[in-house]
Interface confidence: low
């Protein structure tokens, strides 16, 4: 941040916020937030990792091929093109100008976000972007829009990263076909630092008896504004190619009812290939409580797509017109037509026909809500809130919100408290079976709506017409499952914020992450599964998965977790420790023998006492080391990345519209 | 598309049905509604019928003058006109409707003559 | 019912002029209004709907106007081929109801 470029409002709210004197000249007040600045100013050797997340490195522009590689080996080498990482909004400002910082902890923060000032309905001051300041998501209000931008969609203006230390560096390092998700979740792994317990989420008080964006019943990396009727999905690296969700607070099992959803903005994803289908979509419609957020692709879900086509159970069949940015959708079920429901939808007033007839029998009297599910696009609803509606409304419906209270349904209620949530570690090898197990543990307990946190959930969430991105896809498959072990990182961080229970579904073998990945849960239920088959059917089920899926995790990667397993403890970061196949004498005995295994193996082929320090702040511009975290580089430079941060190429090829 | 029967020459005090094809798209999802144009004046809605329920809706002004009935089989919408008078002589529409009440697209019409 | 006045009743114009045409509703009908274009012998076609929105393929010379009571349909940069009677229409409340029509025709 560049205190001198601040207007005086601006260091007094900075000041404020740091809990510091907010009287003075502009001066003195310049001086006093320079001061705060330089003493949050981490150390030289603080390690900013794939969890850190500070943001975009100072000198890369979206447009602009990065300069300055490592001298450690070879020529700089830059990410591949396209995959530049870029800042992510600090937030979202709802009316009141205010963030809601889901999802960066106070201390994590490298950069500030300033509030637009509104100029007039088509469109917002601008403040000139500077090379530096890496533009985060704001939604673009044209003027071409056909109504007025909505007063309460004023996002964050840019973030303004910190200077020094933000080198954009990468190192080379052999290209390896077969690097799965459980490759890059072992090397993430191996790493150690210990982050702060999170700030805790800010507690709105909303009235809870409106129909709004539910925040319990939503994608983690859905971000919904405060006041509870606009949202946008994260968009920066990998988690441009998920699918984001949300789930209204009411629904309804009766009467003729209607929402509008507009799309706002079709936010910019520069940094996804040309070659993705459909980098920009809505699909917009109905679903139960007890879906998924992935509307359409499930029985009991219904949605009507940009791409002009309606799914349900991940049928797609063409239906009405293709939509996008500026659009408004009415969706309407009218429960009154017999012993079915109809579904429809208009766009922008004009009526697309009946999209789905639901036996009422089948849905055995459950509510439906309403349900948004949103690829890099920035949303808002209308529930009935808007004193006019956006559009031409089906004569006979009325508006969700519109309905009395003891007419509509409300959607699951979230925990009150940390305390009722729980946190389910994974514990083992991969191909154990954990992703079964979370699943199934996940089914049998519906009332829990567990979030799944791990690389197989969010490569679900990168789907194609409701099929899976397989690995004839025609990108860098490893790239892929690298930016989804990105996604996975952030998404713990902003789920240790938010009251849910959730199942990290990950190898978790090593002690170190056991402990590291557990500590910003305090206060949580903190469990550990421990999935440990026989070695016998460990080896049965990795050929399984290999046969299914191609070659995961590589042998040398899966030695070094078997030398490093640690079976946890109940203890400072974990209230239980449950075994579901071995036991835990049984399951002592196979880890130890895996211990020996490990390490008569030896190290791993490729640089694994490499600590030569370099590569840029870890997992930002490349390679880096693949080496221990025990023995760390010099002082003078951050480690090498985990992962080459910039990624690959990514992107769609052979599939069908999105 | 939406095709409409040929044109009608009636005596007062007889009733007609005229017939409405509905071709290229699936017959029960849109709904069909009916107007009246009488000659050199403006378009009056006469009605709607839901062809998936058979379901209507009159104008009140028409009820009891004009039936509408589907044939879902043969994609077919009808209207029978009872008790003409020269009142009655005009062009009827068809029309392929949004639940909104908009006309998004239209037969080619039908001329109904009552004449003694 | 809701009445729907449309003005003017006649209206001449040139191949090249700008020309507009207002239908008042008895009511608040909201954004709910249509226009359509009818040609002599033919039947009527779906200009704008909610107002503002074309239908498509209608060139974008012709534009929709006016929430409320007040809605303008405005023809900029006439065409032979706009020569024709035009309707507005309601659609917020059942019955369904017209204006009496403009016809367009030239000088």
């Known amino acids: 941040m560049d205190v001198r470029r601040l207007k005086v409002n601006e260091l007094r709210e900075e000041l404020q916020r740091r809990g510091l004197d907010t009287r003075g000249l502009k001066a003195e007040l310049a001086e006093r937030l320079q001061a705060a600045l330089e003493a949050e100013e981490p150390d030289d050797e603080r390690e900013l990792d794939a969890d850190d997340e500070p943001g975009r490195p100072g000198h890369i522009n979206e447009e602009v091929e990065t300069e300055g590689g490592s001298e450690l080996e070879g020529t700089a080498q830059p990410p591949p093109p396209g995959l530049q990482p870029h800042a992510e909004p600090g937030g979202y400002s709802g009316p009141d100008g205010h963030y809601a910082m889901d999802n960066i902890t106070r201390q994590n923060q490298f950069y500030d976000t300033q509030v637009i000032k509104q100029e007039n309905e088509s469109g917002y001051e601008r403040r000139p972007l500077e090379m530096e300041q890496q533009q985060a998501y704001r939604p673009e209000m044209k003027t071409e829009m056909k109504q007025g931008a909505p007063t309460s969609f004023l996002p964050p203006e840019a973030s303004q990263l910190k200077p020094d230390r933000q080198q954009f560096q990468s190192r080379k390092r052999p290209y390896e076909e077969n690097r799965g998700r459980g490759y890059f979740e072992h090397r993430e792994d191996r790493r150690g630092r210990s982050p702060q317990p999170p700030a805790e989420e800010d507690e709105d008080d909303f009235d809870d008896t409106l129909v709004a964006i539910d925040t319990y019943n939503c994608d983690l990396h859905f971000k919904v504004a405060r006041d509870r009727s606009s949202g946008y999905p994260l968009t920066i690296e990998g988690f441009a190619y998920l699918w984001s969700g949300a789930r209204a607070s009411y629904g309804v099992r009766r009467g003729r009812v209607c929402f509008e959803m507009k799309i706002n903005e079709e936010i910019s994803v520069k940094h996804l290939p040309s070659t993705e289908p459909d980098p920009h979509v809505v699909r917009i419609g109905w679903s139960l409580d007890s879906c998924s957020t992935q509307l359409g692709e499930e029985p009991f879900s219904y949605g009507y797509g940009g791409t002009g086509k309606k799914s349900t159970n991940s049928r797609f069949e063409n239906y009405g017109d293709k939509f996008a940015e500026n659009d408004v959708i009415g969706c309407f079920a009218d429960f009154e037509c017999g012993n079915d429901v109809e579904l429809s939808f208009t766009k922008n007033g004009k009526w697309m026909g009946i999209a789905f007839r639901i036996q009422k029998e089948a849905l055995g009297g459950q509510a439906l809500y309403p349900h948004v599910l949103v690829k890099n696009c920035a949303v808002e609803f209308n529930f009935g809130q808007r004193a006019e509606p956006y559009c031409s409304v089906l004569p006979g419906f009325t508006f969700i919100q519109h309905l009395p209270l003891s007419e509509r349904i409300r959607g699951t209620v979230g925990p009150k408290s940390k305390a009722e949530c729980e946190i389910l570690m994974m514990v083992g090898l991969p191909a154990a079976g954990k992703t079964t197990w979370a699943i199934k543990h996940a089914a049998s307990n519906p009332s829990k709506k567990y979030n799944i946190l791990g690389t197989n959930a969010i490569m679900d969430k990168m789907r194609v017409m409701g099929l899976r991105r397989q690995r004839n896809y025609a990108g860098r498959w490893d790239v892929l499952i690298q930016q989804a072990t990105q996604c996975l990182n952030r998404l713990i961080q902003i789920a240790a914020r938010k009251k849910r229970n959730y199942i990290l579904d990950q190898t978790n073998v090593y002690g170190s992450a056991q402990r590291r990945k557990m500590r910003p849960f305090e206060g949580f239920q903190r469990k550990a599964i421990v999935i440990c088959p026989t070695d016998e059917d460990l080896k049965d089920r990795t050929i399984k998965r290999t046969d299914e899926e191609g070659k995961d995790v590589p042998d040398h990667a899966v030695l070094e977790m078997k030398a490093n397993f640690t079976l946890p403890d109940v203890g400072d970061f974990l209230d239980e420790v449950l075994f579901i196949e071995l036991q835990r004498e049984e399951a002592d005995k196979l880890v130890r023998q895996y211990n020996e295994e490990g390490r008569k193996a030896g190290p791993p082929p490729e640089k694994r006492f490499d600590n030569r320090g370099g590569g840029g702040f870890r997992g930002r511009g490349g390679g880096g080391g693949f080496q221990r975290y025990e023995n760390r580089g010099p002082p003078g430079g951050n480690r090498g990345g985990f992962q080459n941060r910039g990624g690959g190429s990514g992107g769609g090829g052979n599939y069908r519209g999105g | 598309q939406l095709q409409e029967s040929g044109p009608e020459l009636v005596k007062p005090g007889a009733s007609v049905k005229i017939s409405c094809k509905a071709s290229?798209?699936?017959?029960?999802?849109?709904?069909i509604l009916w107007v009246k144009q009488s000659h050199g004046k403006s378009l009056e809605w006469i009605g709607n019928?839901?062809?998936?329920?058979?379901?209507?809706t009159y104008n009140l002004k028409f009820k009891g003058k004009a039936t509408l009935t589907v044939d879902k089989s043969s994609s077919t919408a009808y209207m029978q006109l009872n008790s003409l008078t020269s009142e009655d002589s005009a062009v009827y529409y068809c029309?392929?409707?949004?639940?909104?009440?908009?006309?998004?697209?239209w037969g080619q019409g039908t001329l109904v003559t009552v004449s003694a | 019912d809701i009445v729907m006045t449309q003005t003017p009743k006649f209206m001449s114009t040139s191949v090249g002029d700008r020309v507009s045409v207002t239908c008042k509703a008895s009511?608040?009908?909201?954004?709910?209004v249509a226009w359509y274009q009818q040609k002599p012998g033919q039947s009527p076609k779906e200009l704008i709907y909610?107002?503002?929105y074309r239908y498509s393929g209608v060139p974008d010379r012709f534009t929709g106007s006016g929430s409320g009571t007040d809605f303008t349909l405005t023809i900029s940069n006439v065409q032979s081929e706009d020569l024709a009677e035009y309707f507005c229409?309601?659609?917020?409340?059942?019955?369904?109801?017209f204006g009496a029509g403009t016809k367009l025709e030239l000088q």
């Open positions: 019928i839901n062809p998936y329920y058979g379901s209507t």
């Open positions: 029309a392929r409707g949004d639940l909104t009440g908009t006309f998004a697209y």
């Open positions: 009511q608040n009908v909201g954004t709910y």
């Open positions: 909610s107002a503002s």
């Open positions: 290229g798209y699936s017959f029960t999802d849109y709904i």
């Open positions: 229409q309601q659609f917020n409340s059942y019955p369904l109801t």
